[in-house]
């Protein structure tokens, strides 16, 4: 059984990472940004189902097109590389997930933009950690 | 010094047509970002549209998008708002505002606003 | 779309007397450049709105320095050290992290 201990880490990094998942939305879904409309062109999959941490895999198994979609943004958009911020995030997914259990991910038949995608994770984010508080 | 100067409001009936225009002065027009903003009679502020430099992008609102075109002319100062297929609801003060993209400001220069009422 | 609401959405306060005004975002704020775009407009009586504050602390220019902003991340506060009667009207917060979008307004006016 979980304890109010490891409860609360989970909360922190699911709090880190609604965090880190919010800050790209807004670096991307703005006005200012030059690339938005090349970036709104790239599809991403998401996940048929996302209540609990092991569908976290669905969000890991997106990172590395996620990256590609960050490597277009210019640099002053991101005052941390597009590398390194997936980095920091994919910690977190392997942590909240856990490595023990092997899920395989079911994708939906409809294809997403990159600012649905982010928000559909946020979402997920944010539910979990109400269930938790 | 400067100014924003809008212009080009009035009564309209719904699904008619009105064409805003926001007159610039006492800054280079072309280095600004310009936006729309609306607000309603006794509400509050409502973007609506925005418009690069350049006129390279534009984004609008969802309560108007496919029925309003934001535009400008660099040559003559001017930014325009095209008004199409017009609603109960459009009716409000039509304000511009310039931002420049680069200094973080935000939008630090407002015109006094034009009203457009649309009414049968 | 980030909604930003403001509260109180009225505020009768005796001049040269304090004032706060406090404004919440359902998302953060905070953009991957490392920059807050959280703004505070005044609005007096017929008159366009006007730009005080501007990434959540710096005064825009001629500002009078009785206006600070405060915050961080998704909640953020405009006060008033002491109002003035050119204070009176109405105070907005806005984003433009993302898709501009405005708080409700909160009306000042003097008791």
């Known amino acids: 059984a979980p304890t109010s201990s490891s409860t609360k880490k989970t909360q922190l990094q699911l709090e880190h990472l609604l965090l880190d998942l919010q800050m790209i939305l807004n670096g991307i879904n703005n006005y200012k940004n030059p690339k938005l409309t090349r970036m709104l062109t790239f599809k991403f999959y998401m996940p048929k189902k996302a209540t609990e941490l092991k569908h976290l895999q669905c969000l890991e198994e997106e990172l590395k097109p996620l990256e590609e979609v960050l490597n277009l943004a210019q640099s002053k958009n991101f005052h941390l590389r597009p590398r390194d911020l997936i980095s920091n995030i994919n910690v977190i997914v392997l942590e909240l997930k856990g490595s023990e259990t092997t899920f395989m991910c079911e994708y939906a038949d409809e294809t997403a933009t990159i600012v649905e995608f982010l928000n559909r994770w946020i979402t997920f984010c944010q539910s979990i950690i109400s269930t938790l508080t | 010094q400067v100014q924003l100067v809008e212009s080009g409001g009035g009564v309209v009936q719904p699904g008619r047509s009105l064409r805003l225009s926001c007159a610039a002065s006492?800054?280079?027009?072309?280095?600004?970002?310009m936006h729309w903003v609306r607000q309603a009679p006794g509400k509050g502020l409502e973007w609506v549209a925005v418009i690069w430099y350049d006129g390279s992008n534009k984004y609008y609102a969802d309560s108007v998008k496919g029925r309003f075109t934001i535009s400008r002319d660099n040559s003559k100062n001017t930014l325009y708002l095209q008004m199409n297929s017009l609603r109960a609801e459009d009716t409000a003060v039509y304000y511009c505002a310039r931002e420049d993209f680069d200094s973080h400001y935000g939008m630090d220069v407002w015109g006094q606003g034009t009203t457009v009422t649309v009414s049968s | 779309d980030i909604v930003m609401t403001q509260t109180p959405l009225s505020s009768p306060v005796t001049l040269g007397q304090p004032a706060s005004i406090s404004c919440r975002s359902s998302?953060?704020?905070?953009?991957?450049?490392?920059?807050?775009?959280l703004s505070w407009l005044q609005q007096r009586p017929g008159q366009p709105p006007r730009l005080l504050i501007y990434k959540i602390s710096n005064r825009f220019s001629g500002v009078p320095d009785r206006f600070s902003g405060s915050g961080a991340g998704t909640d953020f506060t405009l006060k008033i050290s002491r109002v003035e009667a050119e204070d009176v009207g109405v105070y907005y917060c806005?984003?433009?992290?993302?898709?501009?979008?405005f708080g409700q307004g909160t009306k000042v006016e003097i008791k």
């Open positions: 998302q953060s704020l905070v953009h991957s450049d490392g920059n807050t775009y």
């Open positions: 806005m984003q433009t992290t993302q898709f501009p979008t």
């Open positions: 006492g800054f280079t027009f072309s280095s600004y970002g």
